[in-house]
Amino acid sequence: FERTRSLQDPCSNCPAGTFCDNNRNQICSPCPPNSFSSAGGQRTCDICRQCKGVFRTRKECSSTSNAECDCTPGFHCLGAGCSMCEQDCKQGQELTKKGCKDCCFGTFNDQKRGICRPWTNCSLDGKSVLVNGTKERDVVCGPSPADLSPGASSVTPPAPAREPGHSPQ
């Protein structure tokens, strides 16, 4: 049936970037400006996404593919295809309903997005803490206490806090 239909249906010959125009005896017409068709055989073209406000254009719309948006500086994408933009916070913070709040003691966030997470529990793996955690950094686990030579100190103070500038995700 599928093969028979494709032989009889002139619309199946319309490539991506065109649509099968019922008003013109099913001739393949190019998609009008600001619209696209990403597959062949379509009877209409889809309207291009517009990246407005906090969204900015990452990839322009073409006759065969939709526009892609990302977020303006200070915001990051959320959801499939960057359906939302969410405010960035500083490292060591998380976004709450009341805005950006510092991570509580024992938690960290080394990115400008996402939540504060508990420091890794090194003892879970039989290790010890090699470098203390901060608001901006997880602990670094080291060898198990048994692996350390007597009198050796296991814990290193955290590296000075800096803004490593994570790429927006």
Epitope: Q111, N121, P164
Partner: antibody, heavy 119, light 107 residues
Framework: QVQLVQSGAEVKKPGASVKVSCKAS????????INWVKQAPGQGLEWIGN????????NYNQKFKDKATITADKSTSTAYMELSSLRSEDTAVYYC????????????WGQGTTVTVSS | DIQMTQSPSSLSASVGDRVTITCRPS??????LNWYQQKPDKTVKLLIY???RLRSGVPSRFSGSGSGTDFTFTISSLQPEDIATYFC?????????FGQGTKLEIK
């Protein structure tokens, strides 16, 4: 014993998708980041992204954001990476790795999965 | 992204030689620098983490040093089983990046 076991080699046609799996055993799967790393033939290592299985929070290298989708199934202690719209340049060995008690280094590596894209 | 410049790209040395590999990130990464060994069979192993910390079970002939933007990996006395490619990797800033690798061969 603590290990990551990856799925077998795949041969795919351009435009297809592939889903590579990474089964963890011998440790608490939800407590460690799983990373995915690409090694193209004769090339170095490239970090694709990672996932924290406890809440499925992901990070991606911007370069792979439209190529890779990383997921995790807590019930089977398995992480997955799906690669879409395959092209010849996606031909590579893909490794899953586990962090060394924080996301900053990788103490455990899977054996690698070879993905070949060829028409 | 932070670029990791690793040198040399390949080297040939004799058993017992002291071998040194350098890694220079394009920006300060504090001490978040790790070294990996990839054997010819493609298996990968973490040798050194946080610049200088030797992973347990790794022979003491391997060592690392440095900070900021200049790091060194040393094998004090090369052994036949050390034939491999060695990679540095920064864990300071997303996306985490690797050096291009140093292929080590025995003379």
């Amino acid at each position: 014993q603590v290990q990551l076991v990856q799925s077998g080699a795949e041969v795919k046609k351009p435009g297809a998708s592939v889903k590579v799996s990474c089964k963890a055993s011998g440790y608490t799967f939800t407590s460690y980041w799983i990373n995915w790393v690409k090694q193209a033939p004769g090339q170095g290592l490239e970090w694709i992204g990672n996932i924290y299985p406890s809440d499925s929070y992901t990070n991606y290298n911007q370069k792979f954001k439209d190529k890779a989708t990383i997921t995790a199934d807590k019930s089977t202690s398995t992480a997955y990476m799906e690669l879409s719209s395959l092209r010849s340049e996606d031909t590579a060995v893909y490794y899953c790795t586990r962090d060394y008690g924080s996301a900053y280094s990788y103490s455990l590596w899977g054996q690698g999965t070879t993905v070949t894209v060829s028409s | 992204d932070i670029q990791m410049t690793q040198s040399p790209s390949s080297l040939s040395a004799s058993v017992g030689d002291r071998v040194t590999i350098t890694c220079r990130p394009s920006q300060d990464i504090s001490n978040y620098l790790n070294w990996y060994q990839q054997k010819p069979d493609k298996t990968v192993k973490l040798l050194i983490y946080y610049t200088s910390r030797l992973r347990s079970g790794v022979p003491s002939r391997f060592s690392g040093s440095g900070s900021g933007t200049d790091f060194t990996f040393t094998i004090s006395s090369l052994q036949p089983e050390d034939i491999a490619t060695y990679f540095c990797q920064q864990g300071d800033t997303l996306p985490y990046t690797f050096g291009q690798g140093t292929k080590l061969e025995i003379k």
